[in-house]
């Protein structure tokens, strides 16, 4: 079992990258002198207790920043949030921490990230640039749920 996080960079099909702005992740076109975040990801160690056919359950964090992506309901709406959390603490927990887990599915070069806590809700960016990452159920044109994940070794 790999028990250190892997590092990766993410961009969407419009070549926008993830940038941290005021504790919020936004997707913006890549430019010079811009510092996209490096993603830290690690598979859930309790994979045998999660659904087998939805993808690889992973914790997603920002490398070196002690921030992890999580899903929580605000009112009736599942929302994507960044929480101060050590990804290895999540990994070592006695149970899957579903609010911080995403099913990572790959199809060719495209990756999707589906919330484990809210099945059917995916990490997405609006088709317009400069918008925060969100969770969506709408897999249509308004939002992009396909991302390119490049592992950094």
């Amino acid at each position: 079992k790999i028990d250190t996080p892997q590092r990766g960079s993410i961009q969407d099909i419009n070549h926008r990258v993830w940038v941290l702005q005021d504790q919020t992740l936004i997707a913006v076109p890549r430019k010079d002198r811009m510092s996209p975040v490096t993603i830290a990801l690690i598979s859930c160690r309790h994979v045998e207790t999660l659904e087998k056919d939805r993808g690889n359950p992973i914790y997603l964090g920002l490398n070196g920043l002690n921030l992890c992506l999580m899903c929580a309901k605000v009112g009736d709406q599942p929302t994507l949030q960044l929480k101060e959390k050590d990804i290895m603490d999540l990994y070592n927990q006695p149970e899957p921490v579903k609010s911080f887990l995403f099913y990572h599915s790959q199809s060719g070069r495209n990756s999707t990230f589906e919330s484990v806590a809210f099945p059917g809700w995916f990490i997405a960016v609006s088709s317009e640039g400069g918008c925060p990452l969100i969770l969506t159920q709408e897999l249509g044109k308004a939002n992009t749920t396909d991302f390119g994940l490049t592992m950094l070794f």
Partner: antibody
Framework: EVQLQQSGAELVKPGASVKLTCTAS????????IYWVKQRPAQGLEWIGR????????KFDPKFQGKATLTADTSSNTAYLQLSSLTSEDTAVYYC??????????????WGQGTTLTVSS | QAVVTQESALTTSPGETVTLTCRSS?????????ANWVQEKPDHLFTGLIG???NRPPGVPARFSGSLIGDKAALTITGAQTEDEAIYFC?????????FGGGTKLTVLG
């Protein structure tokens, strides 16, 4: 108010099986894990295992594998512990407890009142 | 399988600070054991007090705190009250199962 209500005391013959019930109110069992714990007279607590009611996946202490079966019915917000091939060693109080994440950690926060099982001929 | 050991009984007085400990037969207790503490009062009334070594869930009085002291997990009651008379169990996580201690019977005189 969060509550776990367990079924009443059982007197069962050796070799038989029994199914204990834990009905939750004040929360949805799909949003948490349900653990089962055994307490024998004048002894400590023993972890039996757990169920994730959202997907029915279970985990057990190896010594209860084959002895205990855990199930859940999310429509009635109820978890079940079935014990088979009963012997006097199974005479105990059995508790269900919610194992819940609060943002920083998991806790055995709410417990049922326990079901007393007596195995005797 | 690991054995988890607690003091069998402790006595304190109202207002005093008392510390209960939890030892593992496999070596030092660490944060990776995610020590939990639960309280049992008469009539099988259990309440969770501490999770993840040192975290308190909502509704648990601030006089209860968890920590690691040396090679053991510890539950400290700062300013014990008569209603704290109970049996206290610790539970430690060992990668794939939970093991409970035998419990500490705490008497609060007065």
């Amino acid at each position: 108010e969060v509550q776990l209500q367990q079924s009443g005391a059982e007197l069962v013959k050796p070799g038989a099986s029994v199914k204990l019930t834990c009905t939750a109110s004040g929360f949805n069992i799909k949003d948490t894990y349900i653990y089962w714990v055994k307490q024998r007279p004048a002894q400590g607590l023993e972890w039996i295992g757990r169920i994730d009611p959202a997907n029915a996946y279970t985990k057990f202490d190896p010594k209860f594998q084959g002895k205990a079966t855990l199930t859940a019915d999310t429509s009635s917000n109820t978890a079940y512990l079935q014990l088979s091939s009963l012997t006097s060693e199974d005479t105990a109080v059995y508790y269900c407890t919610r194992f819940h994440w609060y943002g920083s950690s998991f806790f055995f926060d709410y417990w049922g009142q326990g079901t007393t099982l007596t195995v005797s001929s | 399988q690991a054995v988890v050991t607690q003091e069998s009984a402790l006595t304190t007085s109202p207002g005093e600070t008392v510390t209960l400990t939890c030892r593992s037969s496999t070596g030092a207790v660490t944060t990776s054991n995610y020590a939990n503490w639960v309280q049992e009062k008469p009539d099988h009334l259990f309440t969770g007090l501490i999770g993840g070594t040192d975290n308190r869930p909502p509704g648990v009085p601030a006089r209860f705190s968890g920590s690691l002291i040396g090679d053991k997990a510890a539950l400290t009651i700062t300013g014990a009250q008569t209603e704290d008379e109970a049996i206290y169990f610790c539970a430690l996580w060992y990668s794939n199962l939970w093991v409970f201690g035998g419990g500490t019977k705490l008497t609060v005189l007065g």
